[in-house]
Interface confidence: low
């Protein structure tokens, strides 16, 4: 047998999760505001046809996407960080970050949550961005247990401006192929997971037009083996 | 794929405890964050508690702390939730959810990847 015969019998026999996918969101969109964070979460309040919905939608449909763990979204996760009084700190000397573990001379961000959505208004939401994505996970149960350091820290770009706000750009959400086995598996689920984002793609740009800013973004999926089985999808195309 | 069974649930008095249990079948249940949701009726699914994948990390919603315990073996292949105090509101099916440990901790029902059946846990006089 070759080495990639032995690959995949043991794929099949020991695994029950396959590779990491990310989703990546190209830089253009304004999290800050609301219905643009409504084109994202998945919480209430939240559209239907939103990132995080559609996401799970694809997870739910295994068969054709290939997709087995639905991707958690950063902007839920910092909107529930937000709200909860033992997370975001600051130092007084400097407004600088300050560990959720931290006592004096520390203190509560106290940030304002507005309207029934309870999330950050513009100004808060770039102030405390970068907080979020510092936070470490306290695991002891009594601290904050939503920090998004370990979570987040490399899935959302983020460019300062005016020394304290934050603009968010790129971003990336990741979930979990299902298993797979063959080569037959391994190029549908590059084809199914680029279906998604085609569809993530369009529904946010049609969006984004009824905003009319301007704006288009691109979502495209990414995962370690993609490059070794793109030629697969256009194979037969490409020998006529 | 994991299969979740849930048991332990039955009618019990106010002020009473229950301890539900949910077996998983699978052989890498310790690579799963676990989670307890329940639904009363007429009302959305709602997030209870949640532990990570070694048990060093507890999160519970605010109407059962400080009642709710949850808890787990894996060697086991089991999560446990042990209700103390039970109050009449507290009545619902409930429900053990499992995901792969990705984000933080998990209190939305999107999150989980694999659901039980339920178990029905009723607290009346």
């Known amino acids: 047998d070759s080495f990639q015969t032995k690959y995949f019998q043991y794929l099949n026999r020991y695994l029950n999760i396959g590779p990491p996918v990310y989703f990546v969101v190209t830089e253009g969109l304004n999290y800050s505001d609301m219905d643009t964070q409504n084109m994202i979460c998945g919480t209430r309040f939240c559209r239907p046809d939103s990132l995080s919905m559609q996401l799970y939608a694809a997870y739910r449909n295994p068969n054709e996407t290939y997709i087995a763990q639905p991707p958690n979204s950063w902007l839920d996760d910092y909107f529930d960080w937000s709200a909860l009084p033992n997370c975001c700190k600051y130092f007084p000397s400097n407004s600088s970050f300050c560990p959720n573990d931290r006592g004096a001379p520390c203190k509560a961000c106290g940030i304002a949550l507005e309207g029934d959505e309870q999330r950050p208004n513009s100004t808060e939401f770039e102030r405390y961005v970068p907080f979020f994505l510092q936070d470490i996970p306290d695991t002891s149960g009594s601290g904050c247990v939503k920090g998004g350091h370990a979570a987040y820290g490399q899935a959302v770009n983020y460019k300062m401006f005016n020394k304290t706000q934050a603009h968010v750009g790129a971003t990336y959400y990741q979930g979990y192929h299902t298993v797979l086995k063959t080569s037959l598996d391994y190029y549908s689920a590059l084809k199914g997971a680029r279906e998604v984002a085609a569809n993530l793609t369009e529904t946010l740009n049609r969006n984004l037009k009824h905003q009319l800013n301007g704006t288009t973004i691109n979502v495209f999926p990414y995962s370690v083996f993609y490059v070794f089985y793109e030629q697969y999808l256009t194979m037969w195309p490409d020998t006529l | 794929q994991v299969q979740l069974q849930e048991s332990g649930g039955g009618v019990v008095q106010p002020g009473g405890s229950l301890r539900l249990s949910c077996a998983a079948s699978?052989?890498?249940?310790?690579?799963?964050?676990m989670g307890w949701f329940r639904q009363a009726p007429g009302k959305e699914r709602e997030f209870v508690a949640t532990?990570?994948?070694?048990?060093?990390?507890?999160y519970y919603a605010d109407s059962v702390k400080g009642r709710f315990t949850i808890s787990r073996d894996n060697a086991k292949n089991t999560v446990y939730l042990q209700m103390n105090g039970l109050k009449p509101e507290d009545t619902a099916v409930y429900y053990c959810a499992a995901k792969m440990a990705t984000g933080t901790a998990s209190i939305r029902t999107y999150e989980y990847a694999y659901w039980g059946q339920g178990t029905q846990v009723t607290v009346s006089s």
């Open positions: 699978g052989r890498t249940f310790s690579s799963y964050v």
């Open positions: 532990i990570s994948t070694g048990g060093g990390t507890t």
